[in-house]
Interface confidence: low
Amino acid sequence: KEVTLMDTSKAQGELGWLLDPPKDGWSEQQQILNGTPLYMYQDCPMQGRRDTDHWLRSNWIYRGEEASRVHVELQFTVRDCKSFPGGAGPLGCKETFNLLYMESDQDVGIQLRRPLFQKVTTVAADQSFTIRDLVSGSVKLNVERCSLGRLTRRGLYLAFHNPGACVALVSVRVFYQRCPETLNGLAQFPDTLPGPAGLVEVAGTCLPHARASPRPSGAPRMHCSPDGEWLVPVGRCHCEPGYEEGGSGEACVACPSGSYRMDMDTPHCLTCPQQSTAESEGATICTCESGHYRAPGEGPQVACTGPPSAPRNLSFSASGTQLSLRWEPPADTGGRQDVRYSVRCSQCQGTAQDGGPCQPCGVGVHFSPGARGLTTPAVHVNGLEPYANYTFNVEAQNGVSGLGSSGHASTSVSISMGHAESLSGLSLRLVKKEPRQLELTWAGSRPRSPGANLTYELHVLNQDEERYQMVLEPRVLLTELQPDTTYIVRVRMLTPLGPGPFSPDHEFRTSPPVSRGLTGGE
């Protein structure tokens, strides 16, 4: 902004400047120029002298002690020397004049003191008017601007020295400039006085609810130029979380309810993600609605989600003691895609309907591909015991399971196992043989399950006899056999569902009889 110290165009009466010489040089006139009455000074020395030396001095211009630099703006008209009759103008015709100044702490009255004036510039017209312009009544005004720097006294005078130009000094304005109070980059900069030269760096103050950028450019700064212009903005303020730049860019306004702004890198307030809300203005995060959560590591920009419902349509298919469990994904995934499944196995006494006691399955039960963190809705189970009762529980979980008070989303199925796989692939093995007994064992049977009513039936035969024997364990001691005799043995399992198939026939031979020492005479 400009602070005017003197402006002749606003003068309501005569200016009364000092003229030297008092006559035949500069003279004050009131003229209508382009429709406006103005008090101006003219000098058009036509007397044909080579050494025209006309001076005009302003009144004392009070500067105060504020501005060390003032600006002068002249509006003037210079007549083209060629426009005079004859085309050459008077002898010594010039088209320039000189601007000078003198500092003083007080008004020195009517003493001109020419030697104390310092020249500022030679003022030249970039356009001069011709006879044609005079006839048409349109006078071209030239504007000259210059600056007076490093002023130290309380006031100054301007002087105009005319060495021979035909000139009209239409207006003279003396002013200094301040960089006005302004807003830039959400920062307020105070009204600032420029320095005597160069730029003055000024720190800005962030507007309410704004703070300086953490970037290298940092706190907002601007530079006040000698011409009163703010230049080279560096850095800026950003609305703090919960606020955004208003439409005019001159304030930070609170995010409306239902929206949020989490950090200064986000340009605007964002609508709350699904299943979340911001009740009040100025939210930095939207809180999840009841029953909805964000998983650890999910930022405020992510929609809130819920735990899944239970898996559906849990079914199984068994083959021997192998089992395949299948199910369908939950009807409600909670709005997430990271649903995982966990399978728990319990072995029970009695059927599920009996409600007998259950305990976790032993280490021999194996799940493929695993029992936890399953991404596909199926699992294979190996290592189950025949004729045992099992309950399988399948639970659906996602990234927000367990964050609230909701129960487990699971479904169960109870299964009574049937026959084991055929014993045809299993082998009877001889543990020990003697002349009259054989000790045998067979592979493939697992530790007996609680409550399972299983026995094994052995079929033993040789050329002379056939016998059947029941045992509870997968081993047997056959006694009262013939020495050095081959026996054919096979085994099968007897279950509540009936007998299983026999194993293949195995041949075992007892040891020869132990020879007793011969006694003499016999």
Epitope: R236, H238, P267, L270, T271, P273, Q301, V302
Partner: antibody
Framework: QVQLLQSGAEVKKPGASVKVPCKAS????????MSWVRQAPGQGLEWMGW????????TYAQGFTGRFVFSLDTSVSTAYLQISSLKAEDTAVYYC??????????????WGQGTLVTVSS | EIVLTQSPATLSVSPGERATLSCRAS??????PAWYQQKPGQAPRLLIY???TRATGIPDRFSASGSGTDFTLTISRVEPEDFAVYYC????????FGQGTKVEIK
């Protein structure tokens, strides 16, 4: 790397509809808005609008309201442009482009390869 | 709606020469436009956005300047791969593109 993959060319009859998918990969789909840009044969670029991939809220440029619908399926990181009641003048290449928002100015920093939609009877 | 007018429509330059593309806004705009490059049969590519920031992978021979209503994209030394159509784009409540300047081999 960051990619926007659009479907192949479509030939449709006037009055029909077309749905152009734009599948994003290599970045968090919901972290950036998606713009749609039209380029008629031999012509310049026309901004059609954009969709906020977080809220699904679309913004349509002048001249692209009514028959043009932007939509999303965030579960498959895909934005869609549906044009109904197709006209011959809808024949153009349609681009999806990821928006880069900054405090100082915006631009579209990743573009799909474009889908040519030809409307002809 | 702000209209962007690009000139010239076609600019013929030789490789190694300087190319200056103009983009004029129908009214003063508060920020510099973004600039894009498009080669035949390809999608546009972002060159410059924001405060004359080059996009990732854009060589430093591309620069932008201007303010108010007059903006310029300068290619300091045109390389063979720079022959393409260039678009300026302003942002605000609605985005608009200029009609494009084709840079062709002289």
């Amino acid at each position: 790397q960051v990619q926007l993959l659009q479907s192949g060319a479509e030939v449709k009859k006037p009055g029909a509809s077309v749905k152009v998918p734009c599948k994003a990969s290599g970045y968090t789909f919901t972290s950036r808005a998606m713009s749609w840009v039209r380029q008629a044969p031999g012509q310049g670029l026309e901004w059609m609008g954009w969709i906020n991939t977080n809220t699904g809220n679309p913004t349509y440029a002048q001249g692209f309201t009514g028959r043009f619908v932007f939509s999303l399926d965030t579960s498959v990181s895909t934005a869609y442009l549906q044009i109904s009641s197709l006209k011959a003048e809808d024949t153009a290449v349609y681009y999806c482009a990821r928006v880069r928002l900054t405090v100082y100015g915006d631009g579209m920093d990743v573009w799909g390869q474009g889908t040519l939609v030809t409307v002809s009877s | 709606e702000i209209v962007l007018t690009q000139s010239p429509a076609t600019l013929s330059v030789s490789p190694g020469e300087r190319a200056t593309l103009s983009c004029r806004a129908s009214q003063s705009v508060s920020s510099n436009p973004a600039w894009y490059q498009q080669k035949p049969g390809q999608a546009p590519r972002l060159l410059i956005y924001g405060l004359s920031t080059r996009a990732t992978g854009i060589p430093d021979r591309f620069s932008a300047s201007g303010s108010g209503t007059d903006f310029t994209l300068t290619i300091s030394r045109v390389e063979p791969e720079d022959f393409a159509v260039y678009y300026c784009q302003q942002y605000g409540p609605s985005w608009t593109f200029g009609q494009g300047t084709k840079v062709e081999i002289k």
